[in-house]
Amino acid sequence: QLPPGKPEIFKCRSPNKETFTCWWRPGTDGGLPTNYSLTYHREGETLMHECPDYITGGPNSCHFGKQYTSMWRTYVMMVNATNQMGSSFSDELYVDVTYIVQPDPPLELTVEVKQPEDRKPYLWMKWSPPTLIDLKTGWFTLLYEIRLKPEKAAEWETHFAGQQTEFKILSLHPGQKYLVQVRCKPDHGYWSAWSPATFIQIPSDFIMND
């Protein structure tokens, strides 16, 4: 029977700069029941605080709700593991909420084949930003990426859409059924997961772009 091994805070993520969650990996348990607690202070502060919510983020997590989240502060946090034989502490992690944003995927992806009379046909897609992100505040610039592939293909074709919420693709294989997905990321932060796939059947008479 031993004191617990050193835990590690391995990830902090925020969906929108208004809340965030951090997760840790326990070290070895030393063969005894082990309690974990996360403490933090904000840079420039010496008041030590305890994790306000160990439930919302699941096991081995600390969730900071709206009232605990400040974009303008760096959080300095540490996890303490304690059993009957002693304690161990994780390294301190410095967290700036601005840099840990991982949005939800974009919403309402719609895909259509457009066949104008005077131009080459194309695939047109549009989507909406995730609901938790308020782009009107100016705090966010969201960038988008699209990927698509024929249903049975292994490789995805990826296109960067910048800040646009619509996109055209000209080069497609006629008669194929395509999967299309979109994801987003803030200018500082992480890519969201890909949106659920939208399927589109490309007509057999679709004319390939030269």
């Epitope: 502060e45 008041l47 030590m48 919510d53 709700g65 009232q67």
Partner: antibody
């Protein structure tokens, strides 16, 4: 409605003890850090003591260290201040105050009066 | 311990006047500063946090500024209901010190 209600204030003699209570309602008490702040008659505000959400961390102003003890019972949604060896200069209206998530006193009780006099 | 010095300790101004109260910290407290209003016989109320963030429901004639060691609370156009004592308070470390207060009266 978010509310804090203090009780336990009284007239006591120097050297005596008193226990103040503060009962919370309308919010998740065990998620918030709590404080006692006092105000002597006709004077300004003075922070007295802080307690973290689980009760593991406590701070005191120098003038009450070793005499006052802050505690909480999250199951009862209650905050306490045990005041021993009371002195005349402890005479004040004692407020309990909630510290919000970014460390500001956002909710205050109405206060309970402690008078220390012989 | 960090001391908070407020000035003036009292002031008298006319309705509509611009009123400025200052608060100095004896050491750098970044912008960990709050302002409270306490009306006679009432409980203190939070006006401003983080030196300049107006709390919801507080009239826009109140504003806060400053960082480091020097802070101000400004009432752009004094109203009769603003008669109160105003306190600054730092909250970056214990003790969570208040300034001595500024009593605002109407001429």
């Amino acid at each position: 409605e978010v509310q804090l209600v203090e009780s336990g204030g009284d007239l006591v003699q120097p050297g005596e003890s008193l226990r103040l209570s503060c009962t919370a309602s309308g919010f998740t008490f065990n998620s918030y850090e709590m404080n006692w702040v006092r105000q002597a008659p006709g004077k300004g505000l003075e922070w007295v003591s802080y307690i973290s959400s689980s009760g593991g961390t406590k701070y005191y102003v120098d003038s009450v260290k070793g005499r006052f003890t802050i505690s909480r019972d999250n199951a009862k949604k209650s905050l306490y201040l045990q005041m021993n060896s009371l002195r005349a200069d402890d005479t004040a209206l004692y407020y309990c105050a909630r510290l919000n998530g970014v460390d500001v006193f956002d909710i205050w009780g109405q206060g309970t009066m402690v008078t220390v006099s012989s | 311990d960090i001391q908070m010095t407020q000035s003036p300790s009292s002031l008298s101004a006319s309705v509509g006047d611009r009123v400025t109260i200052t608060c100095r910290a004896s050491q750098d407290i970044f912008n960990y500063l709050a302002w409270f209003q306490q009306k006679p016989g009432k409980v203190p109320e939070l006006l401003i946090s983080a030196a300049s963030t107006l709390q919801s429901g507080v009239p826009s004639r109140f504003s806060g500024s400053g960082s480091g060691t020097y802070f101000t609370l400004t009432i752009s156009s004094l109203q009769p209901e603003d008669i109160a004592t105003y306190y600054c308070q730092r909250y970056n470390s214990a003790p969570l010190t208040f300034g001595g207060g500024t009593k605002v009266e109407i001429k």
